[in-house]
């Protein structure tokens, strides 16, 4: 199975608590209405932007308390035996290539951060997302070309890496020898995806790459 039901629920951000509250309010007012998620998200983020620090304080307190709860629960949490396998990442495996948007962010993050020093990680990412969406197709092209080149290189590298076979991870109690090659590859793909997610988090990237050129 995918997740361990005993694993502590992930910690929620102040904004997530705010959205949750908005949802509950909306449900109370319109119990039968179906929610247009993107519209709802937009309205929430607009409302959040106009809120004072005092108003946000309540949600920040909730987030702090939840962080403490999560850390407390994680201290006593023992993952199931098989789960340690996910933790192993071969340092020699080719790194998943960045997307065009990710490359663009690396270029313009310093400007956004410099111009708005107090901006949260999420808001920096949001501004970069808006910037990307307002960028004409031809101005995205250099980033798309570079991303395509890196993807091509990655595909060659990963093919060569798989052809060589992974280092003997079995010794580390990671991959059982009897697993089929297909399953092994599926897992590698999954790990690659997680790698990119982790990298994007490290790079302050929580922004979706919605490349909607007109």
């Amino acid at each position: 199975g995918k997740g361990d039901p005993k694993k502590p629920r992930g910690k929620m951000s102040s904004y997530a608590f705010f959205v949750q509250t908005c949802r509950e309010e909306h449900k109370k007012k319109h119990p039968d209405a179906s929610v247009n998620f993107s519209e709802f998200s937009k309205k929430c983020s607009e409302r959040w932007k106009t809120m004072s620090a005092k108003e946000k304080g309540k949600f920040e307190d909730m987030a702090k308390a939840d962080k403490a709860r999560y850390e407390r629960e994680m201290k006593t949490y023992i993952p199931p035996k098989g789960e340690t396998k996910k933790k192993f990442k071969d340092p020699n495996a080719p790194k998943r290539p960045p997307s065009a948007f990710f490359l663009f962010c690396s270029e313009y993050r310093p400007k956004i951060k410099g111009e708005h020093p107090g901006l949260s990680i999420g808001d920096v990412a949001k501004k970069l997302g808006e910037m990307w969406n307002n960028t004409a197709a031809d101005d995205k092209q250099p980033y798309e070309k570079k991303a395509a080149k890196l993807k091509e290189k990655y595909e060659k590298d990963i093919a060569a890496y798989r052809a060589k076979g992974k280092p003997d991870a079995a010794k580390k109690g990671v991959v059982k020898a009897e697993k089929s090659k297909k399953k092994k590859e599926e897992e590698e793909d999954e790990e690659d995806e997680e790698d990119e997610e982790e990298e994007e988090d490290e790079e302050d990237e929580e922004e979706e790459e919605d490349d909607d050129d007109e």
């Epitope: 270029e107 313009y108 310093p110 400007k111 307002n134 250099p142």
Partner: antibody, heavy 120, light 107 residues
Framework: EVQLLESGGGLVQPGGSLRLSCAAS????????TGWVRQAPGKGLEWVSG????????QYADSVKGRFTISRDNSKNTLYLQMNSLRAEDTAVYYC?????????????WGQGTLVTVSS | DIQMTQSPSSLSASVGDRVTIICRAN??????LNWYQQKPGKAPKLLIS???SLESGVPSRFSGSGSGTEFTLSISSLQPEDFASYYC?????????FGQGTNLEIR
């Protein structure tokens, strides 16, 4: 105050080379895309080339592709345009310009220009 | 390449007049249209970006409108310092082309 100051223009023979420089001050140079726009005597404006903040991404007009190279040195706050295989039609005032809005070519600040004359 | 055509090429007007310059693109450029003012022997100066956003420090008598392929720059009441050349530019597609210019002179 934002300032862009071009230098390096002059008279050069067809087939010759020239390197233009643009010294930037009054803003954080490494945050902005910058580029070159030229204007032939008595004529309109023509976009020549652009370069991303880090210098890792470049764009060129077809008329100069393969002959001109744009580069930047963020530690020196300077933009460059290396012009090779110059032709008579490259004669123009060359302006260095800053793109104020990300990668979009909206030139919010310009230098005073440097004249390049290609003639035998 | 996207062709930008300005009309008129030159225009005579008096102080206090309202003037309009038209810029047409030969294909849709959404709102990626900018206007510049250039005085003789000087560098161009950005007036309006994204069709209608006035740059800071630009007097409110300047305004821009349009979308798709047809755009206008209007000056509501001409001042002596407004006599100059005006260029439109598309920032939608490479190469980022300019109109041929409109020379605004005193009648």
């Amino acid at each position: 105050e934002v300032q862009l100051l071009e230098s390096g223009g002059g008279l050069v023979q067809p087939g010759g080379s020239l390197r233009l420089s643009c010294a930037a001050s009054g803003f954080t140079f490494s945050w902005y895309e910058t580029g070159w726009v030229r204007q032939a005597p008595g004529k309109g404006l023509e976009w020549v080339s652009g370069i991303s903040p880090s210098g890792g991404y470049t764009q060129y007009a077809d008329s100069v592709k393969g002959r001109f190279t744009i580069s930047r040195d963020n530690s020196k706050n300077t933009l460059y345009l290396q012009m090779n295989s110059l032709r008579a039609e490259d004669t123009a005032v060359y302006y260095c310009a800053r793109s104020g809005v990300g990668a979009t070519k909206i030139f919010d600040y310009w230098g005073q220009g440097t004249l390049v004359t290609v003639s035998s | 390449d996207i062709q930008m055509t300005q009309s008129p090429s030159s225009l005579s007007a008096s102080v206090g007049d309202r003037v309009t310059i038209i810029c047409r693109a030969n294909e849709r450029i959404n709102t990626y249209l900018n206007w510049y003012q250039q005085k003789p022997g000087k560098a161009p100066k950005l007036l309006i970006s994204g069709t209608s956003s006035l740059e800071s420090g630009v007097p409110s008598r300047f305004s821009g409108s349009g979308s798709g392929t047809e755009f206008t720059l209007s000056i509501s009441s001409l001042q002596p310092e407004d006599f100059a050349s005006y260029y439109c530019q598309q920032s939608y597609s490479s190469p980022y082309t300019f109109g041929q210019g409109t020379n605004l002179e005193i009648r």
